[in-house]
Interface confidence: low
């Protein structure tokens, strides 16, 4: 996957459902939304190479380490 950043979401949770079985090679960009006052769970939004955006399960094995790295000290953008 390409660049990733922990992003502060605006006012509410972003993901209401997650998509399973996405191959990492299909992902061009990852946004990780940290837990905060707007939403009580970590959320992951993937931009795919076909232009679509989907929500991924942050518990997916291939994502866990990436997410932890981002949340522990990576970039944060508003």
């Amino acid at each position: 996957a390409g660049p990733a950043a922990a992003v502060l979401r605006e006012l509410r949770c972003v993901c209401l459902q997650t998509t399973q079985g996405v191959h990492p090679k299909m992902i061009s960009n990852l946004q990780v939304f940290a837990i905060g006052p707007q939403c009580s769970k970590v959320e992951v939004v993937a931009s795919l190479k076909n232009g679509k955006e989907i929500c991924l399960d942050p518990e997916a094995p291939f994502l866990k380490k990436v997410i932890q790295k981002i949340l522990d000290g990576g970039n944060k953008e508003n």
Epitope: V7, L8, R9, E10, L11, R12, V14, C15, L16, Q17, Q31, S40, V45, E53, I54, C55, E77, N78
Partner: antibody, heavy 119, light 113 residues
């Protein structure tokens, strides 16, 4: 085919409570939030609140806190809304509506349940 | 709460004409994180529940005829029907989908001459 089937019309007395249901079919019930919307007398729409059927978590419009209570029964793929301490102001058609995913909007709506509060 | 204001409240047009209706929000509906506008449009025909036409301000829901187009950003949005058909007789609502509580406009009633 996606369907949200709501319970039938209700005639209730002031001060009473009513519980209306919304049975989902044709999709994975726990994968989509369920919204409830009030429509008074053919007028505009008021969002009451939303429930996440997977976790039972809710968010309410402040205006309807204490008035509406949202619940789900995962085993029957059914969402419920209970309205309490009813007054004539609560007479309306109430819709359940499935919430979409990444970009929001409510993509499927129940046919509506008419609630009439009258003594 | 975000206030949604629609205009006109009603309009009457002949079949085949182009129609535009406006929706203004009291706060921006643009999410700066993903540069998307959280604005939806619904059509409600007499005796029916609302039906989603447009979400994300401009994305047509699957199955919605391409004569319906949503546009705009921030606080000003427009729904255009390029060539009105008799079956488009309905009330059209816009909805703030950016922040809780979700709020709806008062609606634009479209009548066919």
């Amino acid at each position: 085919e996606f369907q949200l089937q709501q319970s039938g019309p209700e005639l209730v007395k002031p001060g009473a409570s009513v519980k209306i249901s919304c049975k989902a079919s044709g999709y994975s019930f726990t994968d989509y939030n369920m919204n409830w919307v009030k429509q008074s007398n053919g007028k505009s729409l008021e969002w009451i609140g939303v429930i996440n059927p997977k976790y039972g978590t809710t968010s309410y419009n402040q205006k309807f806190k204490g008035k509406a209570t949202l619940t789900v029964d995962q085993s029957s793929n059914t969402a419920y809304m209970q309205l309490s301490s009813l007054t004539s102001e609560d007479s309306a058609v109430y819709h359940c509506a499935r919430g979409m995913g990444l970009l929001f909007g409510m993509d499927y709506w129940g046919q509506g349940t008419s609630v009439t509060v009258s003594s | 709460d975000i206030v949604m204001t629609q205009s006109p409240s009603s309009l009457s047009v002949s079949a085949g004409e182009k129609v535009t209706m406006s929706c203004k929000s009291s706060q921006s509906l643009l999410n700066s994180g993903n540069q998307k506008n959280y604005l939806a449009w619904y059509q409600q025909k007499p005796g029916q529940p609302p039906k989603l036409l447009i979400y994300g301000a401009s994305t047509r829901k699957s199955g919605v005829p391409d004569r319906f187009t949503g546009s705009g950003s921030g606080t000003d949005f427009t729904l255009t029907i390029s060539s009105v058909q008799a079956e488009d007789l309905a009330v059209y609502y816009c909805q703030n989908d950016h922040s809780f509580p979700c709020t709806f406009g008062g609606g634009t009633k479209l009548e066919i001459k």
